[in-house]
Interface confidence: low
Amino acid sequence: DFGLDCDEHSTESRCCRYPLTVDFEAFGWDWIIAPKRYKANYCSGECEFVFLQKYPHTHLVHQANPRGSAGPCCTPTKMSPINMLYFNGKEQIIYGKIPAMVVDRCGCS
Amino acid sequence: DFGLDCDEHSTESRCCRYPLTVDFEAFGWDWIIAPKRYKANYCSGECEFVFLQKYPHTHLVHQANPRGSAGPCCTPTKMSPINMLYFNGKEQIIYGKIPAMVVDRCGCS
């Protein structure tokens, strides 16, 4: 398994992981105590036939070409958690590991 | 976690799992001994904001709206394997569990 890494200067048009810093303060999400911002990353780009396909299923659906199938799209294929300190709905302070907050790899599925 | 199930008569345009039978014989994949066909299913449809989003990350990227982020897309969020009997590259008959061959649930990521 591998995925491409790009930045805003890349000429790559295929499915790629791009850097993105999420700033909770800028969103007005004041219930998040820490971190105030973190590197989330995101996936963007074209999914050429068989390029970075995660599953054999993706290839089979492309072959069968059913009505309405849009072809594979560029989406996270590996994600990781971050630890966060936040207020829950009862105004209690919670420290916890929030899953799937960071994109580590992008692929076509 | 839940996902919508549709069929070809559905009026749903949002992200949904549709039935699809993959026929290996029709593809000319004669190295597959069994099954000759199986129910693979596939995902198709629009991803409304926060509808069926698998990860909080998806929502955050939508908020941050970076250049080139296309919004979430409808993709398998739960898959299961099937057992297959097939010839490998050395013409040996292999019986094995092939992962991620059946879409059990679709979501937006």
Epitope: - | C6, S10, E46, G71
Partner: antibody, heavy 124, light 107 residues
């Protein structure tokens, strides 16, 4: 409260085009499908198509497909329906309606809010 | 396309009466049927969805029933404000199709 306010009445000549607007307020415009329905004078209701403002994907009734275009402007929370090559039998009141989704099954929705309607008269 | 046949096309009734309007689909629509009320010069108003569920704010004198291809709207005790035209709509398949309407008039 949730409201759909449509543009005013129009008089058009045969062969011309008309563009009707539907301004939404009181809810998140991008999260709901907008449908268009028309009603000729003294006649029943006819579904024309829908559009999803989040990404502009539309679905048209085959009967109008060659002549209709539905668009949205998310910056102003406005949906538009343009009908081209107008004929006298296109004289009708055109309504926009919001699709409200209430369940987990594919067709679990109904029209919960309607615009007030826009009369389009096609006459030479 | 699915055809929706509504009957009767017009109906005369008195205040206090119980009336029933029917809608027949050309194929099974899986209870994906809505009912609307429309008054002259006004937009339609949703009354019932999913064949028998009442839209919030609609009085309980309106009720819907049916399954498969046959559906009914019942108004239990007519009031002056109920005299209007009623339409059914199937949302099981595109294109969505309406019944031709039932005009409910005061006798």
């Amino acid at each position: 409260q949730v409201q759909l306010v449509q543009s005013g009445a129009e008089v058009k000549k045969p062969g011309a085009s008309v563009k009707v607007s539907c301004k939404a307020s009181g809810y998140s415009f991008t999260g709901y499908f907008m449908h268009w329905v028309r009603q000729a004078p003294g006649q029943g209701l006819e579904w024309m198509g829908n559009i999803y403002p989040y990404n502009g994907v539309s679905n048209y009734n085959q009967r109008f497909k060659a002549r209709v275009t539905m668009t949205t402007d998310t910056s102003t929370s406005t949906a538009y329906m343009e009908l081209r090559s107008l004929r006298s039998d296109d004289t009708a009141v055109y309504y926009c309606a919001r699709r409200y989704y209430y369940g987990t099954k594919p067709a679990d929705w109904y029209f919960d809010v309607w615009g007030q309607g826009t009369l389009v008269t096609v006459s030479s | 396309d699915i055809q929706m046949t509504q009957s009767p096309s017009s109906l005369s009734a008195s205040v206090g009466d119980r009336v029933t309007i029917t809608c027949k689909a050309s194929q099974d629509i899986n209870s994906y049927l809505s009912w609307f009320q429309q008054k002259p010069g006004k937009a339609p108003k949703s009354l019932i969805y999913r064949a028998n569920r009442l839209v919030d704010g609609v009085p309980s004198k309106f009720s819907g029933s049916g399954s498969g291809t046959d559906y009914t709207l019942t108004i239990s005790s007519l009031q002056p404000e109920d005299f209007a035209t009623y339409y059914c709509l199937q949302s099981d398949e595109f294109p969505l199709t309406f019944g031709q309407g039932t005009k409910l008039e005061i006798k």
